[in-house]
């Protein structure tokens, strides 16, 4: 049942990416939808040795990753605003989960290049649009109505069954033949009691 609901959720949430609408828009597929979440791909040139990559949602810093090297060429990777991220030799991927309408926004990859010099900042981005498919919307509209109707039918059914049961019971009580049989039983009981007293 749980997996069924999950697949329904996956089916309902679709992601559309509108790039090229902003300056410095990504010239690659920036958003990759999978497992009910989105992978936001922030690329950097292979030559870059040390950098800071920030994921911005509008103007807010959601995630960051900094890669530096020490005097012994030892690599240090830090995150001040931690997100699930993945580093490769030419990209940083940030992962966002449990998507809903509030995630729909402009997302930017803010790259600060420390090494090689000169220090440089580049901004690339795109719009992450989360929409529901027509069928999903129809389902979402009719599902509660259907459920409500089902509940109403169940209640009405219960009422009807109760009423029929009551009717059947009351009809057996008011049957003339039945009444005579009942009276006979009462009379017989009365007589036996009187006999007991007499004796």
């Amino acid at each position: 049942m749980k997996s069924g609901l999950w697949y329904f959720f996956l089916f309902c949430l679709r992601i559309k990416v509108l790039t090229g609408e902003i300056n410095g828009s990504a010239n690659y597929e920036m958003f990759i939808f999978h497992n009910g979440g989105v992978q936001i791909l922030c690329k950097y040139p292979d030559i870059v040795q040390q950098f800071k990559m920030q994921l911005l949602k509008g103007g807010q810093i959601l995630c960051d990753l900094t890669k530096t090297k020490g005097s012994g060429n030892t690599v240090s990777i830090k995150s001040l605003k931690f997100c699930h991220s993945q580093l490769s030799n030419n990209s940083v991927s940030f992962f966002l989960y449990n998507l809903d309408h509030s995630h729909a926004n402009y997302y930017f990859c803010n790259l600060s290049i420390f090494d090689p010099p000169p220090f440089k900042v580049t901004l690339t981005g795109g719009y992450l649009h989360i929409y529901e498919s027509q069928l999903c919307c129809q389902l979402k509209f009719w599902l509660p109505i259907g459920c409500a109707a089902f509940v109403v039918v169940c209640i009405l059914g219960c009422i009807l069954i109760c009423w029929l049961t009551k009717k059947k019971y009351s009809s057996s009580v008011h049957d003339p033949n039945g009444e005579y049989m009942f009276m006979r039983a009462v009379n017989t009981a009365k007589k036996s009691r009187l006999t007991d007293v007499t004796l």
Epitope: S71, G72, T74, S76, P116, P117
Partner: antibody
């Protein structure tokens, strides 16, 4: 302007301990790896130790490993070098340096450590 | 550990003349497209100063008479026209791996 000011040097007996400090200003201290480099009187430069931005990575020269400990306090913008079991060959001017991504781009004036009985 | 050697130990050059310092590493300092070699200048009574990084890139504010060249294991620092303020000891240094090491230095004087 980047400034690095070392302190804590002085005369110490062999086997003794000393703690050097380096007060940093003029830059975001927590964004940089920091190093200690020493220079014996009339000799060349020798790298001693380094530490990454938050202190989670430290490295040491084979000459001082196990005897010296590098640390930092980013809240105080200060770099430290705890020197134990000092030897005569540790006598040198100790420089605090900023590793500026691809070279030691800022140096303090140095503090002299003399190990002698 | 990588061993750095420099030659000559010292040299005296006339003002305006060219000074050339050589540095050799015991193994290649080339990684990708970068040579992990830097040059420092240390004037008497002063701390060292970064001149050249990645074997050939001048640090900001360093006069263009200073230039670096070489790749792999052999590197050169050239002062194209020696000035009085260039009197110093020059060190090469690698940061290819840990521990980073310095060359023994080359002292440059005016003839």
């Amino acid at each position: 302007e980047v400034q690095l000011v070392e302190s804590g040097g002085g005369l110490v007996q062999p086997g003794g301990s000393l703690r050097l400090s380096c007060a940093a200003s003029g830059f975001t201290f927590s964004d940089y790896w920091m190093d200690w480099v020493r220079q014996a009187p009339g000799k060349g430069l020798v790298w001693v130790s380094n530490i990454d931005e938050d202190g989670s990575i430290t490295e040491y020269s084979p000459f001082v490993k196990g005897r010296f400990t590098i640390s930092r306090d980013n809240a105080k913008n200060t770099l430290y070098l705890q020197m134990n079991s000092l030897r005569a060959e540790d006598t040198a001017v100790y420089y605090c340096t900023r590793w500026g991504r691809f070279g030691f781009d800022s140096w303090g004036q140095g503090t002299l450590v003399t190990v002698s009985s | 550990d990588i061993v750095m050697t420099q030659s000559p130990d010292s040299l005296a050059v006339s003002l305006g003349e060219r000074a050339t310092i050589n540095c050799k590493s015991s193994q290649s300092l080339l990684s990708g497209s970068f040579n992990y070699l830097t040059w420092y200048q240390q004037k008497p009574g002063q701390p060292p100063k970064l001149l050249i990084f990645y074997a050939s890139t001048r640090e900001t504010g360093v006069p263009d008479r200073f230039s670096g060249s070489g790749s792999g294991t052999d590197f050169t620092l050239t002062i194209s026209s020696l000035q009085a303020e260039d009197v110093a000891v020059y060190y090469c240094h690698h940061h290819y791996n840990a521990p980073p090491t310095f060359g023994p230095g080359t002292k440059v004087d005016i003839k």
